[in-house]
Every structure is written in structure tokens, then in C-alpha cells.
Interface confidence: low
């Protein structure tokens, strides 16, 4: 195992989770671990210098980011409550307050609303037959290529994420109740002939 920083012929670092290719110096360097950020970029002679994220900020993954992400509180006004606090390596975990359920937009729970009597289960969505009263709820399965992952009276099936649009590759296919899981593609060097 080579110790960063090191040069490698095909620009594919040995441990792609914890190392990255630094094009400025044509070397493989260490990423910073969760909870830390790059204080000084590596050079030919010195590896990455990492520092702990400042108070009220975090980085969740091995990274070569120059800053940490700002912690955001769970928004009570939008119906959320905190399950776990923000730490240097994890953002705050929020969930809907009791008696409320998620309203999704682009696969993200954007706010919570009061649950009604009929809850559509994951993999289904509400088919509203009385548009005016919005009371007669019938749950129908998601169409192919869509998913819905919560129990909610107004849940709508969302299209599966297309990893390639985000420059990612598919790690696991989507189902009717879960989205496609994307991952970073192999480091550019892995594509070299």
C-alpha cells in the first residue's frame, strides 16, 4: 500500500474511498475523514492537512472539501422535530411530528402535514376521486419507474432518480417503494485505455 502523496501511472488511486487524484500535482492524496475538512491541499511532498469541522458544521463523508456544511435545525414551523442532533460528521436527523406525515418534492420531505384517516402505504399513491372535497382517497400502485416511500394521505409517486443526469452511476435499482441508489462513478483514471 502506497502512502499519500504518491504518483501512480493510471491516475486511479489505490483506495478510492479515502484517496483522490489531485490534478494540480498529478498525485494521489488522502481525503479527509467524516467530520473534517481540507485545511491545506496536498502537494507533491506533503499530504492533505485536515481539520475538524467548526462548531455547528459537518461533513458526512470522506471528502476533499475546503469547507464544512452548515448544520440546519429541524424546522418546527414545517412540522419537523429533531431525532438526533447535528454533529461534526452528521447533519441533524429530522422527522415529522406525531400525527403528521411527509409531503415530498423531488424525493425530499419538504414539510409535514396532518395525517388524515386514509394513509397510502409505500409503493402506492393517493388517487383523489373527489377533487373538490379531497376526501375520497383511493390508493393505487406506483407506475413503473416511480416510487413512493412513506405512509401518507397525499403521497405522490416520484420518478426514480436518473443517476446519469447527475453524473453518477446506478448502485441499486429503484423499486415501487424506494428510489434508485446512485454512487460516484469510478475515478476518471479508471476510464483510461
Amino acid at each position: 500500500q502506497l502512502v499519500p502523496p504518491y504518483r501512480i501511472e493510471n491516475q486511479t488511486c489505490w483506495d478510492q474511498d479515502k484517496e483522490y487524484y489531485e490534478p494540480m500535482h498529478d498525485v494521489c492524496c488522502s481525503r479527509c475523514p467524516p467530520g473534517e475538512f481540507v485545511f491545506a491541499v496536498c502537494s507533491r511532498s506533503q499530504d492533505t492537512v485536515c481539520k475538524t469541522c467548526p462548531h455547528n458544521s459537518y461533513n458526512e463523508h470522506w471528502n476533499h472539501l475546503s469547507t464544512c456544511q452548515l448544520c440546519r435545525p429541524c424546522d418546527i414551523v414545517l412540522g419537523f422535530e429533531e431525532v438526533a442532533p447535528c454533529t461534526s460528521d452528521r447533519k441533524a436527523e429530522c422527522r415529522c411530528q406525531p400525527g403528521m406525515s411527509c409531503v415530498y418534492l423531488d424525493n425530499e420531505c419538504v414539510h409535514c402535514e396532518e395525517e388524515r384517516l386514509v394513509l397510502c402505504q409505500p409503493g402506492t399513491e393517493a388517487e383523489v376521486t373527489d377533487e373538490i372535497m379531497d376526501t375520497d382517497v383511493n390508493c393505487v400502485p406506483c407506475k413503473p419507474g416511480h416510487f413512493q416511500n412513506t405512509s401518507s394521505p397525499r403521497a405522490r409517486c416520484q420518478p426514480h432518480t436518473r443517476c446519469e443526469i447527475q453524473g453518477l452511476v446506478e448502485a441499486a435499482p429503484g423499486t415501487s417503494y424506494s428510489d434508485t441508489i446512485c454512487k460516484n462513478p469510478p475515478e476518471p483514471g479508471a476510464m483510461l485505455l
Epitope: E9, N10, Q11, P23, D26, H64, L65, G189
Partner: antibody, heavy 114, light 107 residues
Framework: EVQLLESGGGLVQPGGSLRLSCAAS????????MTWVRQAPGKGLEWIGV???????YYTDSVKGRFTMSRDNSKNTLYLQVNSLRAEDTAVYYC????????WGQGTTVTVSS | DIQMTQSPSSLSASVGDRVTITCQAS??????LSWYQQKPGKAPKRLIF???SLESGVPSRFSGSGSGTDFTLTISSLQPEDFATYYC?????????FGGGTKLEIK
């Protein structure tokens, strides 16, 4: 001082071929990836591709299968073989040091015309 | 590929003016951005790398800033030799991409 000197350009007919060279000095050539960039007359800069220190290559889509990069580390020289040339390949061709293109040569002109 | 949108495409200014050129990436590129100056008939010369680091020998009137998707090149007080075309370039992804260029002309 880092110096890069391209050569091999000229006038060629559509469908023809040329071999461009880039002689490097002033740095440890074998350590560095090297980049080719071109600039059509009156236009902006277009990345062609990169060749790493061991000879691995990566090309832009428009030249894949027609252009081939190679290098001879013992001669401190970089090459770009350009085949099946088209009118739209008319440009000044630059070699540049590293995959980030930090220092450039003066360029060599390729004109594709019948 | 990452697209780089540079503005303005041309700019008229006078000696002594402060000039700002902007570059926007189609996706986040951290600080993997360079700025180049090109004079007619000459090769591009890198002025700034890593968004804000000045190449040695480049006058301090040139400065760069930005991170993520939005970047700026500033010339604090234009000199006669600064009239040229300026390009931004990302090197976050292996396939380098350049902005369309900004031609800086004398007013």
C-alpha cells in the same frame, strides 16, 4: 524554465493525416500527464485529450477513433497522430503540461483544405 | 461534460479601470478553476489557478475569487498590456472545459 515546442503542422487535404510533436524541457517530463488543446480560427479553446505519465489516454468525443496521443519519455516528447482530418479540425494545436494545462507551447497550425 | 459560461463576451474599458469577468460552472467544481490570458497570435498564459492562487510573475492587480459554481476574475487597475482575451477553465473533471472567452478591448 518549462518549455514546450510543437511541430508537425501544415496543410493537409480532407481525410489526410499528420503527426504533431511536442518537445518538452525544463521539467521532469516522465512525471507529468500532458494535455492537447486546439483553437479554431477566431474561436475559443477546445480540450482534445490527456495522456498520463504511463501512456494512458482520455479523449474528447469529437476526436475519438481519429486522434491518438502517445509519448516517448526517453525523448521528452509528446505526439498527436491526427487521422481522417476534416475541415473543422483546422486549428492551432497546443500541447500543455499536466492534466490541468498549466504551461502551454506556442502551438502548431493544422489547415485542412482541398 | 461540465459547461463553463463566461460573461461578458466582450468588454471595452480604459487604462486604470477596474474590470470584472465572471464564469459560471454548470455543476460544482470546488475551486478547480484557472484563468488564462491570450494575446493575438500567442498561446494562452495561465494567470490564476485554484480559483484564487496567482501564478508567480503575474502582477498583483489580477485576482480571482469564487468556489463551487461562481467565479470572478478582477483586474484592479487596467494597464495597456492587459488588453487581451481571457478564458476560464475548469479542471474538476478530467475533460477540461473552457469558457467562451472575454475579449477586453480599449475604449
Amino acid at each position: 524554465e518549462v518549455q514546450l515546442l510543437e511541430s508537425g503542422g501544415g496543410l493537409v487535404q480532407p481525410g489526410g493525416s499528420l503527426r504533431l510533436s511536442c518537445a518538452a524541457s525544463g521539467f521532469t517530463f516522465s512525471y507529468y500527464a500532458m494535455t492537447w488543446v486546439r483553437q479554431a480560427p477566431g474561436k475559443g479553446l477546445e480540450w482534445i485529450g490527456v495522456i498520463n505519465s504511463g501512456g494512458g489516454t482520455y479523449y474528447t468525443d469529437s476526436v475519438k477513433g481519429r486522434f491518438t496521443m502517445s509519448r516517448d519519455n526517453s525523448k521528452n516528447t509528446l505526439y498527436l497522430q491526427v487521422n481522417s482530418l476534416r475541415a473543422e479540425d483546422t486549428a492551432v494545436y497546443y500541447c500543455a503540461k499536466a492534466s490541468t494545462a498549466d504551461v502551454w507551447g506556442q502551438g502548431t497550425t493544422v489547415t485542412v483544405s482541398s | 461534460d461540465i459547461q463553463m459560461t463566461q460573461s461578458p463576451s466582450s468588454l471595452s474599458a480604459s487604462v486604470g479601470d477596474r474590470v470584472t469577468i465572471t464564469c459560471q460552472a454548470s455543476q460544482g467544481i470546488s475551486n478547480y478553476l484557472s484563468w488564462y490570458q491570450q494575446k493575438p497570435g500567442k498561446a494562452p498564459k495561465r494567470l490564476i489557478f485554484a480559483a484564487s492562487s496567482l501564478e508567480s510573475g503575474v502582477p498583483s492587480r489580477f485576482s480571482g475569487s469564487g468556489s463551487g459554481t461562481d467565479f470572478t476574475l478582477t483586474i484592479s487597475s487596467l494597464q495597456p498590456e492587459d488588453f487581451a482575451t481571457y478564458y476560464c477553465q475548469q479542471y474538476n473533471s478530467y475533460s477540461l472545459t473552457f469558457g467562451g472567452g472575454t475579449k477586453l478591448e480599449i475604449k
